[in-house]
């Protein structure tokens, strides 16, 4: 019963991170304008991962497209691509972690492979919600770089022809929705690999076997032993898995570049 | 077509409260935020302030804040500009007016001339 | 606040010739977020409120004559006037439409010559 509730909330909260990673990737202000010296604003600038927007005071918003993709930084490409490859990890994790759900029985399915799912969508959630937490983070170092880098060059003049104050961009709603999104991921891909420790079946080995050795008949119950220890055949049976540890290091943020009113 | 009918001339005296409103019609009356627009006798033009009439939220000019309110009625596509103690430098003519595209006012009020006089 | 300085303060132009007023702020009213300047252009008749000729520096309102132009970038912007008609003789002012307070230029007094 446990295992099936583990299983159950480990699927839903994935569901709802992966939900949020979508969301977070299509939102339009994953940076929005820094308002340090101006509150109340009369043309308010911010910027996705797909196309930046004006919000004039009027109330009309224009939002335009990137419609180039090589004139685009890198580090924007790379937080495209790791928001991607979370968002195509968590659908395949939870297509696969549906039909390995416990309450739902398809045909003949045994419970060993019913585990091997768990466990599959458990790692494809956890390198989901990695991938959502460095691509917003690598975004996020990105704005701290260009907010100092800005903030040092506040008047600078465009090419010497246009004196234009620099717009500073600050942290938007989308980082913190895809933060928390990729958290719950993780979360929900943890959740999933220890529900499948419970499904996976642990052979009792209790069944009195016989060893005729010359001469005596004796009957051996070795089972115990052979479980606590790892050694004889009966072990390809018994799953080991050591809870989806993971290093800090994989989800460092790299050093970047990026761009009120 | 686009209308801002504006309330009728008012003489104050110092000190007191005038309210002069702006009825608007021909067109989506929350789908635009309306500004106030002062102009004194012979002289140019001063932005007193806005309001969203969608969600009724207010910029005022640092100038005005504190003697100056602007409210909306809904029901009747109304807005209205409340300015107190009044002073003989209030004497102008305000003008309520719609803010479109580049935060530039399209429709104007015909206006409306507020005299402070002891 | 961005202070708007109009010049001249008048201008007197003949019939069919062309006008000119400039208009100064003392702050960049470029957009970065999407290129356009946020700087407006009146025109105002006696005894009549204004009336919005052109928005975004440069973008005509629908319905004002193409004699009516705008131009300029940043901090400097210019109205013109290509061939002046009777009916163009006003009062125009341009606007910070960039930042709040929003402000108005002193106005120039167009006259016929």
């Known amino acids: 019963m446990a295992v099936t509730a583990c299983q159950g909330l480990g699927f839903v909260v994935s569901l709802i991170g992966i939900a949020g990673i979508i969301a977070a990737t299509c939102m339009d202000q994953w940076s929005t304008q820094d308002l340090y010296n101006n509150p109340v604003t009369a043309v308010f600038n911010y910027q996705g991962l797909w196309r930046s927007c004006v919000r004039e005071s009027s109330g009309f918003t224009e939002c335009r497209g990137y419609f180039t993709l090589l004139g685009l930084p890198a580090m924007l490409q790379a937080v495209r691509a790791l928001m991607i490859v979370g968002i195509v990890l968590g659908a395949i994790g939870l297509l696969v972690s549906i039909f390995a759900l416990k309450c739902i029985r398809i045909g003949s399915m045994e419970d060993s492979a019913k585990a091997n799912m768990t466990l599959t969508s458990g790692i494809m959630f956890i390198v989901s919600g990695l991938c959502a937490i460095a691509g917003v983070s690598v975004f996020a170092n990105m704005l701290v770089t260009n907010f100092w880098m800005s903030t040092a060059n506040m008047y600078t003049g465009m090419g010497g022809m246009v004196q234009t104050v620099q717009t500073r961009y600050t942290f938007g709603a989308a980082l913190f929705v895809g933060w928390v999104a990729g958290g719950l991921t993780l979360i929900g891909g943890v959740m999933m690999c220890i529900a499948c420790r419970g499904l996976a079946p642990e052979e009792t080995n209790y069944k009195a076997v016989s060893y005729h050795a010359s001469g005596h008949s004796v009957a051996y119950k070795p089972g115990g032993f052979k479980a606590s220890t790892g050694f004889g055949s009966n072990t390809k049976n018994k799953k080991i898995y050591d809870g989806g540890a993971r290093t800090e290091d994989e989800v460092q943020s790299y050093p970047s570049k990026h761009d009120y009113v | 077509q686009v209308q801002l009918v504006q309330s009728g001339a008012e003489v104050k005296k110092p000190g007191a409260s005038v309210k002069v409103s702006c009825k608007a019609s021909g067109y989506s009356f929350t789908g635009y935020n309306m500004n106030w627009v002062k102009q004194a006798p012979g002289q140019g033009l001063e932005w007193i302030g806005n309001i969203d009439p969608y969600y009724g939220g207010t910029s005022y000019n640092q100038k005005f804040k504190g003697r100056v309110t602007l409210t909306i009625d809904k029901s009747t596509s109304t807005v209205y500009m409340e300015l107190s103690s009044l002073r003989s430098e209030d004497t102008a003519v305000y003008y309520c007016?719609?803010?479109?595209?580049?935060?530039?006012?399209?429709?104007w009020g015909q206006g409306t001339t507020v005299t402070v006089s002891s | 606040d961005i202070v708007m300085t109009q010049s001249p303060d008048s201008l007197a132009v003949s019939l069919g010739e062309r006008a000119t007023i400039n208009c100064k702020s003392s702050q960049s009213l470029l957009n970065s977020g999407n290129l356009k300047n946020y700087l407006t252009w009146y025109q105002q008749k006696p005894g009549q409120p204004p009336k919005l000729l052109i928005y975004w520096a440069s973008t005509r309102k629908s319905g004002v004559p193409d004699r009516f132009s705008g131009s300029g970038s940043g901090t400097d912007f210019t109205l013109t006037i290509s061939s002046l008609q009777a009916e163009d003789v006003a009062v125009y002012y341009c606007q910070n439409d960039y930042s709040y307070p929003l402000t108005f230029g002193g106005g120039t007094k167009v006259e016929i010559k």
């Open positions: 007016a719609r803010m479109y595209h580049g935060n530039a006012f399209d429709y």
